[in-house]
């Protein structure tokens, strides 16, 4: 596949994953769809670190847009040279995107491992932290959290989604990093008539 077409495909995938991360992070702020917990000290630190919004979202949106532009035609100088200019920009933004996706993965992984902050036996805290992630395999005790309601499945689902999305983002940003580097040195494989006059 041409580096340009590959960049466009990767870029669109990254933008989609960005939106998934941003939506997932937004939903983490409203456990069980209830806004009453958002302004209180009852959400876990990993939710407030905004891994999905900042890392997997905004920081990956840049390489996503850059990759789509690098796969486009014209705009930055004429022909081959202009494309190489955009490919170079995509190299740097992809590296930036990898950092963002790693941040999202780290925060979401910690969120999954520690479990949510919840009220259990009259005490607020990270009650699942003790289990080092083993609670994920034993659902019988998820119900011991009294509030926010159904916070454990809510957090597990959304943090799992963020982990999966950020892993894909790391792979895609890595692919685009290699693809854009090839594009910088070798140019695009498109024929002359494809380029604007």
């Amino acid at each position: 596949m041409c580096t340009g077409k590959c960049a466009r495909c990767v870029g669109l995938s990254l933008i989609t994953l960005c939106l998934v991360c941003i939506v997932a992070n937004a939903l983490l702020l409203v456990p069980n769809g209830e806004t009453s917990w958002t302004n209180t000290n009852h959400l876990s630190l990993q939710v407030w670190l905004m891994g999905g919004f900042i890392g997997g979202g905004l920081m990956v949106l840049c390489p996503g847009i850059a990759a789509v532009r690098a796969g486009g035609k014209g705009c930055c100088g004429a022909g081959c040279c202009g494309n190489r200019c955009r490919m170079l920009r995509s190299v740097f933004s992809s590296a930036f995107g990898v950092l963002g996706a790693i941040y999202c993965l780290s925060v979401s992984g910690a969120g999954l491992r520690n479990g949510p902050r919840c009220l259990m036996n009259g005490e607020w805290g990270y009650h699942f932290e003790d289990t080092a992630g083993a609670y994920l395999l034993n659902r019988t005790l998820w119900d011991r959290c009294e509030a926010p309601p159904r916070v454990v499945p809510w957090n597990v689902t959304l943090f799992s989604l963020l982990v999966a999305a950020s892993c894909l983002e790391i792979v895609l940003c890595g692919i685009q990093l290699v693809n854009a580097t090839i594009g910088v040195f070798c140019g695009d494989c498109r024929k002359k008539q494809d380029t604007p006059h």
Partner: antibody, heavy 120, light 112 residues
Framework: QVQLEQSGGDLVKPGGSLKLSCAAS????????MSWVRQTPDKRLEWVAT????????YYPDSVKGRFTISRDNAKNTLYLQMRSLKSEDTAMYYC?????????????WGQGTTLTVSS | DIVMTQSPLSLPVSLGDQASISCRSS???????????LEWYLQKPGQSPKLLIY???NRFSGVPDRFSGSGSGTDFTLKISRVEAEDLGVYYC?????????FGSGTKLEIK
């Protein structure tokens, strides 16, 4: 098989202190919440303390809060109950019990019990 | 604190008969998750208590099917369909829904 071996029961004067131990074997101790339950001379059962699997969370009824401390050493597979400022009403048979899971749930296994007598 | 009241305090039965023990809580022990953490324990003479029933009606492993639990809200019942000699002892109900966790005063099952 699951075994909970208790020790440390004694005759203590009011205001005194005592530490009970419960040595666990036959299961992964660090994966289970543990509790102490006592049985008074009139055969009533009373929950005394609970500790989560990693020791991060502890719970007590008001009757013992501030006087009793539950702790655990997961490396030694041992549960402890440190009792201070003992009163005559603390006289009881003390049982350690395992919870099904890392925190408060049903008591699925119990120790054989150890007797504390608080008397002058 | 939630007070668990058991009745009767003593229950004389003939072997093979059905026995029924009642446990009433001073307030609802329905947990906010929708579960009711009510358990039944049997303490035989000279032994530690043993779990029979958890979450109102679930039999613990190894417990014979002649034991059954039922109820909701504040009223709970343990039924033994055909009493056997090994069932004799003191039965305790326990609520683990709200701290402080509390036991019932016990019901002594004995031969008539």
């Amino acid at each position: 098989q699951v075994q909970l071996e208790q020790s440390g029961g004694d005759l203590v004067k009011p205001g005194g202190s005592l530490k009970l131990s419960c040595a666990a074997s036959g299961f992964t101790f660090s994966s289970y919440g543990m509790s102490w339950v006592r049985q008074t001379p009139d055969k009533r059962l009373e929950w005394v303390a609970t500790i989560s699997s990693g020791g991060g969370y502890t719970y007590y009824p008001d009757s013992v809060k501030g006087r009793f401390t539950i702790s655990r050493d997961n490396a030694k597979n041992t549960l402890y109950l440190q009792m201070r400022s003992l009163k005559s009403e603390d006289t009881a048979m003390y049982y350690c019990a395992r919870h099904e899971g890392f925190t408060t749930y049903y008591f699925d296994y119990w120790g054989q019990g150890t007797t504390l007598t608080v008397s002058s | 604190d939630i007070v668990m009241t058991q009745s009767p305090l003593s229950l004389p039965v003939s072997l093979g008969d059905q026995a029924s023990i009642s446990c009433r809580s001073s307030q609802s022990i329905l947990h906010s998750s929708g579960n009711t953490y009510l358990e039944w324990y049997l303490q035989k003479p000279g032994q530690s208590p043993k779990l029979l029933i958890y979450k109102v009606s679930n039999r613990f492993s190894g417990v014979p099917d002649r034991f059954s639990g039922s109820g909701s809200g504040t009223d709970f019942t343990l039924k033994i369909s055909r009493v056997e000699a090994e069932d004799l002892g003191v039965y305790y109900c326990f609520q683990g829904s709200h701290v402080p966790f509390t036991f019932g005063s016990g019901t002594k099952l004995e031969i008539k």
